[in-house]
Amino acid sequence: QDPYVKEAENLKKYFNAGHSDVADNGTLFLGILKNWKEESDRKIMQSQIVSFYFKLFKNFKDDQSIQKSVETIKEDMNVKFFNSNKKKRDDFEKLTNYSVTDLNVQRKAIHELIQVMAELSPAAKTGKRKRSQMLFRG
Amino acid sequence: QDPYVKEAENLKKYFNAGHSDVADNGTLFLGILKNWKEESDRKIMQSQIVSFYFKLFKNFKDDQSIQKSVETIKEDMNVKFFNSNKKKRDDFEKLTNYSVTDLNVQRKAIHELIQVMAELSPAAKTGKRKRSQMLFRG
């Protein structure tokens, strides 16, 4: 059994999240994850889900009674979602920490917008892939 | 030329983001995107970037002077990133709108944590893939 399971059970007690009525009015994440089978679609959704948990854990970081549980779960997320890649995790954290109301951040974001947009579609990633797609179009 | 380009130039004026000094102290998004070539890694990062822009645009939604530009850019993001798939866009928006300080949301999130974690690694997605991996392990 993965180490996170026991710690997640501990968090359920802490948040009174074990009762069946918690599941009333549908799920937050599970229903959405069920909708997407394609790996890249799942990553789009999981990216938001993981950042939600990181934010949640951050809000409770000064509560010693759940620190071990939170750290264990975060470490397991690191292994599972970031494939234990520190650079990937750090880049992700950087993105989640940018303040949307900071004027310098806003300016940089708008300055970079055209290039960001150009890279959004998978086809835009490499000239190579674009060419190979053209070949299939006859 | 994609329609977003002209509108992004308009936003550059609005945010005073056209000057070269805006690029001082490195980039927000472009440097990070350069680090990741694998499609699923890129989606993890782009998911955060797109949600940043959506949040930014939301804050400025009451200013009529940039509404056309914002709508055009959002629509183009919808085409490029969500492949014009309304369901995908809606699920994404749902995830970005969950409040991390709402007690019911917190409880649901913790209630779903074990199952979310179980689905985080690509290998966990289907039993079929897990079995095929076992075969390669000799």
Epitope: L103, Q106 | Y14, F15, N16, N59, F60, D62, S65
Partner: nanobody, 121 residues
Framework: QVKLEESGGGLVQAGGSLRLSCAAS?????VGWFRQAPGKEREFVAA????????LYADSVKGRFTISRDNAKNTVYLQMGSLEPEDTAYYSC?????????????????WGQGTQVTVSS
């Protein structure tokens, strides 16, 4: 860099009037007034565009308050009339660092120190 300085606050009787001034240094496209009453959230009062040709008001002050600007003096004014005890608050002027014209306070990046307005019944 934008700097904002308010003046004109004070104590006034209900039904009276008061004029607040906001002196701005640096380029400002929009200037807004916000207020915060004791124990309450800060709220939008009024805003004026760079040209002075367009103004926005909170519903609670419409018809009683008038915002204006004198670009030659780099000053924005808030003329407050028919004052009520509910108008008692700390009034601050603010400016966005963008060309934003609206009432969302998160888009206002520069703030003055503020001035106290007290309306007695």
């Amino acid at each position: 860099q934008v700097k904002l300085e308010e003046s004109g606050g004070g104590l006034v009787q209900a039904g009276g009037s008061l004029r607040l001034s906001c002196a701005a240094s640096g380029l400002t496209y929009t200037v807004g007034w916000f207020r915060q009453a004791p124990g309450k959230e800060r709220e939008f009062v009024a805003a004026i565009s760079w040209s002075g040709g367009s103004a926005l008001y909170a519903d609670s002050v419409k018809g009683r308050f008038t915002i204006s600007r004198d670009n030659a003096k780099n000053t924005v004014y808030l003329q407050m009339g028919s004052l009520e005890p509910e108008d008692t608050a700390y009034y601050s002027c603010a400016a966005p660092g963008t060309r934003y014209y609206g009432s969302n306070q998160v888009n206002y990046n520069y703030w003055g120190q503020g001035t106290q307005v007290t309306v007695s019944s």
